[in-house]
């Protein structure tokens, strides 16, 4: 058993049918010695008396808010949560496996640049009685500071019969140098509590591996005289690290017909312009990627050919 | 990328081309190592990230773009001097650029070159003959060093009398390649920045 926060405790259980569970001793936080009784949640049934209460915690029915009283007055509370260990592996019931970029990916994180700021998000089908708490650091043995905000509900979607909820959090490394070469990964730890169930999820990454630039901005077309060709131009996104000559991007320019089946013409360039043939009803799209370290491509920025 | 790519101008800052080749070569070598050594811990998540140049060179600090010198977090151990040197800078206005930066890059390359050659000698003794260093990568390191044209003492190739532990050598190869790729990215960024200046 360990303390998650004041008066909230996590009991770790080897979870299998007929498991013996864990013996837990609760102590009433009071100078009083006599006439103390214990109850669980809203029930008025007295579970025991005395300054301490010994319970055998086996199932969720044994978890909850234990309260000690004296003469009708509440003295203190202890909330017991359960953390299930199923065949040596901690349960992952609360969050959905996003399966990207690989199986067992519960937390996904992205950074728009090298400033040390990043966003993580996760999915769940649970709509109520759900709380999250996020901590982060650079490295784990001698951790350096990363400050995270509060997790917030950022999107709701309908997936088949289920509703899916997306939560996200923004974090900022306290003293980040954009040009630094990372040798210790960022660690992100999310505590999730649903009703009386506790779970924790972790992700470990280098900022360089989660970079995804914003799409190029100011995408414009300039027709070339007496030609079906157009000059496409764009700019680096505002959120990208500067100077751009040091943090360079490379670009992919794509001409896509109206139908998805039509052949796509693609050109790669390090410049912020390109000359392409603009077909009728086609659209031109441009996306960006770090020129030197191949992390994710940005989303496409698009303009119609007409 | 096997699709059309815009080619750089021929009159470019001479080292940029070499540094781009370097990054391509080390990236290819790392990919090859990860595929060949699939049963070894060779992914970024599995290895310890060690920098053999730590406390010996200060490339990141010495080559920091001027715009980032205002960032407190980037100035931990910065001791830059604005002097010009090295043939890469020959035909440019480089009054603001640091000789320290280019000599630091040169020292990095020299250190990695020695490590890689020592390692290759060990790998050649492996009866499994599983993996060797790409000669192209070693050649590209050499070319960039020549382009940088800094003279410094020759570092003798390390020789080891004990029987090599091939498992450890292959894991060390992965660690070295990961670290060298990160340094090659920094070198490429620096060269690109110098080219634009």
């Amino acid at each position: 058993i360990w303390e998650l926060k004041k008066d909230v405790y996590v009991v770790e259980l080897d979870w299998y049918p007929d498991a013996p569970g864990e013996m837990v001793v609760l102590t009433c936080d009071t100078p009083e010695e006599d006439g103390i009784t214990w109850t669980l949640d809203q029930s008025s049934e007295v579970l025991g008396s005395g300054k301490t209460l010994t319970i055998q915690v086996k199932e969720f029915g044994d978890a909850g808010q234990y309260t000690c009283h004296k003469g009708g007055e509440v003295l203190s509370h202890s909330l017991l949560l359960l953390h299930k260990k199923e065949d040596g592996i901690w349960s992952t019931d609360i969050l959905k496996d996003q399966k990207e970029p690989k199986n067992k990916t519960f937390l996904r994180c992205e950074a728009k640049n090298y400033s040390g700021r990043f966003t993580c998000w996760w999915l769940t089908t649970i709509s109520t009685d759900l709380t999250f708490s996020v901590k982060s650091s650079r490295g784990s043995s001698d951790p350096q500071g990363v400050t995270c905000g509060a997790a917030t509900l950022s999107a709701e979607r309908v997936r088949g019969d289920n509703k899916e909820y997306e939560y996200s959090v923004e974090c900022q490394e306290d003293s980040a140098c954009p040009a630094a070469e990372e040798s210790l990964p960022i660690e992100v730890m999310v505590d999730a509590v649903h009703k009386l169930k506790y779970e924790n999820y972790t992700s470990s990454f280098f900022i360089r591996d989660i970079i995804k630039p914003d799409p190029p901005k100011n995408l414009q077309l300039k027709p070339l005289k007496n030609s079906r060709q157009v000059e496409v131009s764009w700019e680096y996104p505002d959120t990208w690290s500067t100077p751009h000559s040091y943090f360079s991007l490379t670009f992919c320019v794509q001409v896509q017909g109206k139908s998805k089946r039509e052949k796509k013409d693609r050109v790669f360039t390090d410049k912020t312009s390109a000359t392409v043939i603009c077909r009728k009803n086609a659209s031109i799209s441009v996306r960006a990627q770090d020129r030197y370290y191949s992390s994710s491509w940005s989303e496409w920025a698009s303009v119609p050919c007409s | 990328r096997n699709l059309p790519v815009a080619t750089p101008d021929p009159g470019m800052f001479p080292c940029l081309h070499h540094s781009q080749n370097l990054l391509r070569a080390v990236s290819n070598m790392l990919q090859k190592a990860r595929q060949t050594l699939e049963f070894y811990p060779c992914t970024s998540e599995e290895i310890d990230h060690e920098d053999i140049t730590k406390d010996k060179t200060s490339t990141v600090e010495a080559c920091l773009p001027l715009e980032l010198t205002k960032n407190e977090s980037c100035l931990n151990s910065r001791e830059t001097s604005f002097i010009t040197n090295g043939s890469c800078l020959a035909s440019r206005k480089t009054s603001f650029m640091m000789a320290l930066c280019l000599s630091s890059i040169y020292e990095d390359l020299k250190m990695y070159q020695v490590e890689f050659k020592t390692m290759n000698a060990k790998l050649l003794m492996d009866p499994k003959r599983q993996i060797f260093l790409d000669q192209n990568m070693l050649a590209v390191i050499d070319e960039l060093m020549q382009a940088l044209n800094f003279n410094s003492e020759t570092v003798p190739q390390k020789s080891s009398l004990e029987e090599p532990d091939f498992y450890k050598t292959k894991i060390k190869l992965c660690i070295l390649l990961h670290a060298f790729r990160i340094r090659a990215v920094t070198i490429d960024r620096v060269m690109s920045y110098l080219n634009a200046s």
């Epitope: 080897d14 049918p17 199932e59 592996i89 019931d93 199986n103 067992k104 | 049963f39």
Partner: antibody, heavy 115, light 112 residues
Framework: QVQLVQSGGGVVQPGRSLRLSCAAS????????MHWVRQAPGKGLEWVAF????????YYADSVKGRFTISRDNSKNTLYLQMKSLRAEDTAVYYC????????WGQGTMVTVSS | SYVLTQPPSVSGTPGQRVTISCSGG????????VKWYQQLPGTAPKLLIY???QRPSGVPDRFSGSKSGTSASLAITGVQAEDEADYYC????????????FGTGTKVTVLG
Amino acid sequence: QVQLVQSGGGVVQPGRSLRLSCAASGFTFSSYGMHWVRQAPGKGLEWVAFIRYDGSNKYYADSVKGRFTISRDNSKNTLYLQMKSLRAEDTAVYYCKTHGSHDNWGQGTMVTVSS
Amino acid sequence: SYVLTQPPSVSGTPGQRVTISCSGGRSNIGSNAVKWYQQLPGTAPKLLIYGNDQRPSGVPDRFSGSKSGTSASLAITGVQAEDEADYYCQSYDRGTHPALLFGTGTKVTVLG
């Protein structure tokens, strides 16, 4: 006393369907994940499928994906395996088992796919 | 499609020490705990070892398990005639959990 009692096995022709049941007692069935495991005659153990305690997630071996469906009725304390488009290579003893460090197995039920 | 490899058979005379190996990889045994099962002819498997080296109550202490790196082993110290059975190791792969990964199985024969 944890008990898993299986039923539903038998002889079936290739291409036909069969449903296996596993009735649980002696524990809170709705709190635990459950597996199906099979063993072809003279062969080793092969995992078939898993279902979460609340039925929210199901996982299948590639060899049965799209043909077999694992399900549970927590109000009846019963686990099911619906097998469709059966093949000769599905012939095996099928076991249900609880998920956890200490597990309990059903007695097994024989499924024979033969024309 | 078995990823955990066991020797097909091992044998020993009563009282001898018999060991069965189970060889896997970094993503299974290297990352997860190992279990061992005993299966007597015509019966369901019975758990012998969980968590690499833990014995459930009721399992004789002549059975012991261990794990090192990407391999595990089961030892029967002082093998007895009633130990003649098939033995299976089991683990998980970190990418496909909760799918059970079973070993190929080992037939233990007690001679004489």
